[in-house]
Each structure stands twice: as structure tokens, then as C-alpha cells.
């Protein structure tokens, strides 16, 4: 049994840090697999972590962690049984991807505003929850040429977007996703997106 | 109630052995690191040894490596101390103390919250 | 190793007067914010060691209000605001970051 890509680690700088790897060949990962980890730190313990199947030869394993800080290095063993297949260490500090932004909701009664609001997914005590900028994806599904990234650089997780640039009579869906400039971490995911139809029309003098 | 009591102490001749105990009662005895600390007569107080809640992970001083060993049976909720090649620098009442929470993925600490009453070891030929 | 230093050895008081004893580490102590791996004891004569301050500025329970902790990095203080006769002793502070763990060498606080 053999490693094929050493694990890569991500830390979602809350609870979690995720790492995916891939096998020389077909693994069953749950079964097969342990990855074991240990924050270098005085009188801590050895936990275990169950990876998952992530295709045929990928896993991925889920680390379940306190909260992070800076000075936090793990040291990762991954075993197959008695036999140790790769030694590594993780500073989820330095390797970090946002949790998404949730409760995306699109808000049409605002006059000729379509406003957007979403939640940050940090609480206010996280070292993240001041750090995050967004970008808003809106596309049309009726018309594939439309698609439009809106970066949010301001911490407060709203967009108003002039209902008159968008076309009339025709559904658009957004989504969202953020990352933290001082953290120099990568973009989360994307939301779930949200859909909506653009019934603004622009007042008859205007037309 | 939350109490540590050791037992063991006494006098050896230098080159002798004690194994001194620290029972724990009133906490969950196997959530938690422990830590042994020494008091020479009329000095200060010396770090001797730790040791996490599960056992797997152990500390010691370099002036008493190689010749401590600490253990526990979390099963009898008890800590260990064996002391072999005992010196006369080694004469020091020796006390037991609870240490951080350990089974957290970053050990919790509280401070070494908890101390037992203290056993004499005097080592003289 | 972590080197503590203590700082006066001996310091008499009268009674109902503040009190500080600093501590000096060789290195930080702080591992993250607000958390400083540093521990004050009290040790009264014929008796166990017993807790009073960790983490730097955390009364431990039972503690009376007049103890404080502060400082951070590598210098720390205990303050004692107003001195009672039950509080003589030993005074140490320890660091708790990693071993060895490793004790001041002690302040002798007596009554004038």
C-alpha cells in the first residue's frame, strides 16, 4: 500500500481542518486507514481520525479541532494498520479556507434596490469574523452570457445592486463566498445560491 | 471532594529504590495529566515529572532521567513514582499534583490546581 | 530550558498594605492572546503548595479578590492589594508552557 499524493491540510480556523490524499491504487479508506494527529503541545494526546472514500483513490479524513491559533503545528501519521505510510505536521494557521457564508437571502422590495444579505459563518470572538471580504457571483439562467462577480471589500455581508442594471422579466440566482485578506487564506466554498425573478421595470418617463 | 494523597516515602540507602503512590479521589482521574514536583529541605520548589491522562505521553527531569519512572492505573485512579539509584540530592519531600485536562484535542489548564499532603524521602546511608 | 527570576526574595509588609512580587521569564510565555503560561503559588509553612494565580491573571477558585496576576511575554507581577497576617509565606511562580516546568526562586513575604 502506497501513497500516491501526500495529504494536503486545510483549516477551517474554527473546528475543523480537512485533509485529502490519494492511494497508489483502489483503497477502501474507512476500512484501511487511520490518520492520527497531535497538537505539539505540553501533555497532549494522540487523537484519531476515520477517513472517507473521496473516489477511487482519494480519502479524506475530517480533523476535529478547538478553536485554532497561530502557534498551533499538528504532527500527522498516516497508517494502514501497523504499518506507517506517511509522517507529516500542519499548521492550520498558515493553511486556511473560510467556512461559506450561509442564509443567503435577495431582498426585491427595497424600491429599485435588489439587496443581498448573507451571514458571516464565524461567531464575533473568532480571529476571522472582522477579516472577511466576499465576492457575489449573480448569473442569469435565462441569459448564459450574464454572469458578474461583485467584490464585497467592506466587512458588512450586504450588496445593493441598482434593480435597472439587471434585465426585466427574467430570473437570476446568486451565490457567495469569502476569504480573510490578513489570514492570506484561500476562497471557501461557494453558498448554496438563491434564485430570484427580476420584476422591476424602470418608470415610463424613463423608458 | 477533590483530594490527592501520597504514600511511599521513607528512608533508603543511596543506590536503593522507593516507588512512591498518589491516590486521586473526587475527579475523573483518567481526564487528566499529573504531575510530580519535589521540595529539598529548606530550598525552593523542583519540577520532577509529568505525566499525560492516558499515560502515552511522559516527562522528567533531566536530574532524574533514567532513573524515575512515572506511571499510572487509571483503573485505580492512582499515580506512580518508581525511584531507583536514589541519591542524597534526591532527599526532598515529594508531592503530587493534578495537572491540565488532557483528553482535549489542546489540553485544558487550570493550573496544578490540586497538591497532596506531601511523602518524605530521605536518602542516607 | 526556561529560566525564572524572582524578584525580591524576601519582602516584609504591614499588614493592610499593597504588596507586589515580579517574575522574569528567559522567554515569552504567551502562546496566545490573553493566555500566558505562567502560575502563581502559595506555600505557607509546614504546608502543601497551594494555587493561586494561572494563566497568567486567573484567580484560581477560592482565592480571595486581593490577588491579582498580570503581565505578559516575559514579565509578570503578583499583587497582593491589601496584606493580611494569613498571608505569609513563600510565593512562586512557575512556568506551564512546556517542560521542564520550572519555578521562581521563591519570595519570603513576612509581616513588619
Known amino acids: 500500500m502506497k501513497v500516491l499524493q501526500e495529504p494536503a491540510c486545510v483549516s477551517d480556523y474554527m473546528s475543523i481542518s480537512t485533509c485529502e490524499w490519494k492511494m497508489g491504487g483502489p483503497t477502501n479508506c474507512s476500512a484501511e486507514l487511520r490518520l492520527l494527529y497531535q497538537l505539539v503541545f505540553q501533555s497532549s494526546e494522540t487523537h484519531t481520525c476515520v477517513p472517507e472514500n473521496n473516489g477511487g483513490v482519494g480519502c479524506v479524513c475530517h480533523l476535529l479541532m478547538d478553536d485554532v491559533v497561530s502557534m498551533d503545528n499538528y504532527t500527522l501519521d498516516l497508517w494502514a494498520g501497523q504499518q506507517l505510510l506517511w509522517k507529516g505536521s500542519f499548521k492550520p494557521s498558515e493553511h486556511v479556507k473560510p467556512r461559506a457564508p450561509g442564509n443567503l437571502t435577495v431582498h426585491t422590495n427595497v424600491s429599485d434596490t435588489v439587496l443581498l444579505t448573507w451571514s458571516n459563518p464565524y461567531p464575533p470572538d473568532n480571529y476571522l469574523y472582522n477579516d472577511l471580504t466576499y465576492a457575489v457571483n449573480i448569473w442569469s439562467e435565462n441569459d448564459p452570457a450574464y454572469s458578474r462577480i461583485h467584490n464585497v471589500t467592506y466587512l458588512k455581508p450586504t450588496l445593493r445592486i441598482p434593480a435597472s442594471t439587471l434585465k426585466s422579466g427574467i430570473s437570476y440566482r446568486a451565490r457567495v463566498r469569502a476569504w480573510a485578506q490578513h489570514y492570506n487564506t484561500t476562497w471557501s466554498e461557494w453558498s448554496p445560491s438563491t434564485k430570484w425573478y427580476n420584476s422591476y421595470r424602470e418608470p415610463f418617463e424613463q423608458r | 471532594e477533590v483530594q490527592l494523597v501520597e504514600s511511599g516515602g521513607g528512608l533508603e540507602q543511596p543506590g536503593g529504590s522507593l516507588r512512591l503512590s498518589c491516590a486521586g479521589s473526587?475527579?475523573?482521574?483518567?481526564?487528566?495529566?499529573m504531575t510530580w514536583v519535589r521540595q529539598a529541605p529548606g530550598k525552593g520548589l523542583e519540577w520532577v515529572s509529568s505525566?499525560?491522562?492516558?499515560?502515552?505521553?511522559?516527562y522528567y527531569a533531566d536530574s532524574v532521567k533514567g532513573r524515575f519512572t512515572i506511571s499510572r492505573d487509571n483503573s485505580k485512579n492512582t499515580l506512580y513514582l518508581q525511584m531507583n539509584s536514589l541519591r542524597a540530592e534526591d532527599t526532598a519531600v515529594y508531592y503530587c499534583?493534578?495537572?491540565?485536562?488532557?483528553?482535549?484535542?489542546?489540553?485544558?489548564?487550570?493550573?496544578?490546581?490540586?497538591w497532596g499532603q506531601g511523602t518524605t524521602v530521605t536518602v542516607s546511608s | 530550558d526556561i529560566v525564572m527570576t524572582q524578584s525580591p526574595l524576601s519582602l516584609p509588609v504591614t499588614p493592610g498594605e499593597p504588596a507586589s512580587i515580579s517574575c522574569r521569564s528567559s522567554q515569552s510565555l504567551l502562546y496566545s492572546i490573553g493566555k500566558n503560561y505562567v502560575d502563581w503559588y502559595l506555600q505557607k509553612s509546614g504546608q502543601s503548595p497551594q494555587l493561586l494565580i494561572y494563566l497568567g491573571n486567573k484567580r484560581a477558585s477560592g482565592v480571595p479578590d486581593r490577588f491579582s496576576g498580570s503581565g505578559s511575554g516575559t514579565d509578570f507581577t503578583l499583587k497582593i492589594s491589601r496584606v493580611e497576617a494569613e498571608d505569609v509565606g513563600f510565593y512562586y511562580c512557575m512556568q506551564s508552557l512546556q517542560t521542564p516546568y520550572v519555578f521562581g526562586q521563591g519570595t519570603k513575604l513576612e509581616i513588619k
Open positions: 499534583a493534578k495537572d491540565r485536562v488532557s483528553i482535549t484535542i489542546r489540553p485544558r489548564y487550570y493550573g496544578l490546581d490540586v
Open positions: 505525566i499525560s491522562g492516558s499515560g502515552d505521553n511522559i
Open positions: 473526587g475527579f475523573t482521574f483518567r481526564d487528566f495529566a
